[in-house]
Amino acid sequence: MCYGKCARCIGHSLVGLALLCIAANILLYFPNGETKYASENHLSRFVWFFSGIVGGGLLMLLPAFVFIGLEQDDCCGCCGHENCGKRCAMLSSVLAALIGIAGSGYCVIVAALGLAEGPLCLDSLGQWNYTFASTEGQYLLDTSTWSECTEPKHIVEWNVSLFSILLALGGIEFILCLIQVINGVLGGICGFCCSHQQQYDC
């Protein structure tokens, strides 16, 4: 098991996932590709929590770059032991992974709440309401009720799709950061197993 290579692998994956989270969150601001609802403040309250942009996005880039940096072979070592610096780095990556767990956890929780509450939409009474808030998420199973939202067009599909994507991406980020906690602890305790000659690609 090469802990450094594994960390780099996780790091690159997190960068991709973070960018996808940011994109998904940004799309939530433009239902049906329109800007008017953001300017009129007719968006779900959970869109304004920036869960994908901050939690699953920017906050995830910090551990991602830390993990990618672990694979570098320029650690000077300490106490006469070449791997000692890398061990310290691996252990410090656990701290970065915990930050990632917090960010992805935030993303997952907000996305789940956004899915459960449903979108803010112009309902069948001509009012801007959280039409499905009282259904406790049951609306997700009954698509026939989605027509209760008359505006924005396809807002239920839009919100369900994007919050589901954020939920999934945040979940994957959470698992990857959890893996890196284990990887970092093992790497820090066991030391680096990769010699200068070993080259593994993700």
């Epitope: 069948s124 009474l125 001509g126 009012q127 801007w128 505006e151 924005p152």
Partner: antibody, heavy 120, light 106 residues
């Protein structure tokens, strides 16, 4: 000024269909909903449904579901209401009405009404 | 379905008198709107949101009430006020109107 102008009176046979138009002027058509109400001779006002003029999504009253179709043409700021399978008790004056979305959703501008007579 | 019952069905009064029209719902509602209709004409908005006077409506018209009981008051009847008055709710679908109160000259 703000107004809704409806199409002229119609006489139809039972089983036929009627399509009433409602042309809006003096305001931004897509900023308001249009609802349809009818009033049979000497009877109360009866709500048929409404249409979101921005998205074109209609909401129909249960009594008319399957028999009514509400549409809009935003290029001409016109709303349409088609009622199928006409019966003699569909004889009424049909009104289109503008309303603003929000807390009170009051109906401040009414069309002049279209008399639809269903008779064999 | 929320049913609105208006009373009285007919109110016979003279010009200058005070008119009090009642509208009762079979369950609690958040607000009510009032309309005036004259023969051969479309209804006209008088009061929205229970107590707010619509644009261009004289101050002699007033609305009040909450929950299930609502009232339209005309402080001093003018000759042009003799018409049919409807209350309307949209707290839930279907939107419903009351049966109307006809205010006629005594």
């Amino acid at each position: 000024q703000v107004q809704l102008v409806q199409s002229g009176a119609e006489v139809k046979k039972p089983g036929a269909s009627v399509k009433v138009s409602c042309k809006a002027s003096g305001y931004t058509f897509t900023n308001y909903g249009v609802k349809w109400v009818r009033q049979a001779p000497g009877q109360d006002l009866e709500w048929m449904g409404w249409i979101n003029t921005y998205t074109g999504n209609p909401i129909y009253a249960a009594d008319f579901k399957g028999r009514v179709t509400m549409t809009t043409d935003t290029s001409t700021s016109t709303a349409f209401m088609e009622l199928r399978s006409l019966r003699s008790d569909d004889t009424a004056v049909y009104y289109c009405v503008r309303f603003q979305y929000g807390d009170y959703r009051y109906f401040d501008v009414w069309g002049q009404g279209t008399l639809v007579t269903v008779s064999s | 379905e929320i049913i609105l019952t208006q009373s009285p069905a007919t109110l016979s009064l003279s010009p200058g008198e005070r008119a009090t029209l009642s509208c009762r719902a079979n369950s609690g509602i958040s607000f009510i709107n009032w309309y005036q209709q004259k023969p051969g004409q479309a209804p006209r908005l008088l009061i929205y949101g229970t107590a707010n006077l619509a644009s261009g409506i004289p101050a002699r018209f007033g609305g009040s009430g909450s929950g299930r009981d609502f009232t339209l008051t005309i402080s001093s009847l003018e000759p042009e006020d003799f018409a049919v008055y409807y209350c309307q709710q949209w707290s839930s679908n279907p939107l419903t109107f009351g049966g109307g109160t006809k205010v006629e000259i005594k």
